[in-house]
């Protein structure tokens, strides 16, 4: 690596993937193993993230960019930048300190993650229950009894909602 000759900061010419080494008269030195610099002019290299155990590598660390982790099958990411992996449960369950537990009556979970949520109370909207709820699905509310006059059109239950980015279970 060539010694930099900038008139202002001699480190400003050090490219990404290197650092300005004060111990070597401000020569641009390559980042050591397991470290990187994503921008030029850095006086230190950043530490690469390691994806180990329940984490798996989604993107390898390079001399210019950090690694990215996700979770091994049966787990899902939680927290900032996938800082944690949480165990998946089945639909109709939630994760507790004692493991996966079935949703209590009157609650449901249509995901492999998250908590059981109460069924919709149709009567609050003046509607009636068209399809009963289960551990895996919310109730489907239909028209109020007064709307069910002869000739009224049938109601098609909506597809279960999914979080963005979640593939069908």
């Amino acid at each position: 690596f060539e010694r930099t000759r900038s008139l202002q900061d001699p480190c400003s010419n050090c490219p990404a993937g290197t650092f300005c080494d004060n111990n070597r008269n401000q020569i641009c030195s390559p980042c050591p193993p397991n470290s990187f610099s994503s921008a030029g002019g850095q006086r230190t290299c950043d530490i690469c993230r390691q994806c180990k155990g329940v984490f798996r590598t989604r993107k390898e660390c390079s001399s210019t960019s950090n690694a990215e982790c996700d979770c091994t099958p049966g787990f899902h990411c939680l927290g900032a930048g996938c800082s944690m992996c949480e165990q998946d449960c089945k639909q109709g369950q939630e994760l507790t300190k004692k493991g996966c537990k079935d949703c209590c009556f009157g609650t449901f979970n249509d995901q492999k993650r998250g908590i059981c949520r109460p069924w919709t109370n149709c009567s609050l909207d003046g509607k009636s229950v068209l399809v009963n709820g289960t551990k895996e699905r919310d109730v489907v509310c239909g028209p109020s009894p007064a709307d069910l006059s002869p000739g009224a059109s049938s109601v098609t239950p909506p597809a279960p909602a999914r979080e963005p980015g979640h593939s069908p279970q």
């Epitope: 994503s38 230190t44 530490i47 993230r49 390691q50």
Partner: antibody, heavy 119, light 112 residues
Framework: SLVESGGGLVQPGGSLRLSCAAS?????????MCWVRQAPGKGLEWIAC?????????YYANSAKGRFTISRDNSKNTLYLQMNSLRAEDTAVYYC????????????WGQGTLVTVSS | ALVMTQSPSTLSASVGDRVTINCQAS??????LAWYQQKPGKAPKLLIF???DLASGVPSRFSGSGSGTEFTLTISSLQPDDFATYYC??????????????FGGGTKVEIK
Amino acid sequence: SLVESGGGLVQPGGSLRLSCAASGFSFTSSYYMCWVRQAPGKGLEWIACIYTGSSGSTYYANSAKGRFTISRDNSKNTLYLQMNSLRAEDTAVYYCARDSSSYYMFNLWGQGTLVTVSS
Amino acid sequence: ALVMTQSPSTLSASVGDRVTINCQASEDIDNYLAWYQQKPGKAPKLLIFYASDLASGVPSRFSGSGSGTEFTLTISSLQPDDFATYYCQGGYYTSSTDTRGAFGGGTKVEIK
């Protein structure tokens, strides 16, 4: 580089807000930015961290929970520590530090700012 | 809470000596351990990360080893610039209610 400011003398029970201005890198690159303190003649103590990515997740040591609040302004590339109900034992040099590893390993530190809690 | 225990707390040595500092974690932290050097009135400087990786700009006379709960920092041949206090730090982010991160108490390396 990281430059802390906002330290000074404050009475017990008072409040103080520390700032840490970052230059040469952007918070938008998603780091853990943290505060570490060192009481006079004592060792280092981790206080709090915040993830500069979109989630902004925060993490606190037990000694900081309830009294200290970490925050950041990505547009200003600045980290903050709001300290309330200060006690004499909070007297220390407060450093801000950067972690890219996700495992409390700080490769970049500020020069520190001294907070003195005394009546 | 994670507790890091360093030994010895003070170490007297001469230039050219091989110096070893130990750090013990109260629970298994895999290789999530860093070593820092601090001089009076200055901020700490990262020496070693992931227990054994040398940080950028750090001389090769510094080395780290260990995994799980037992870790070691070694200075192969002590130089005048190495008289300072050394700290180990271990930890990892779990959740905001159960975060593990702690420094050891420090080891002061002084001139014999």
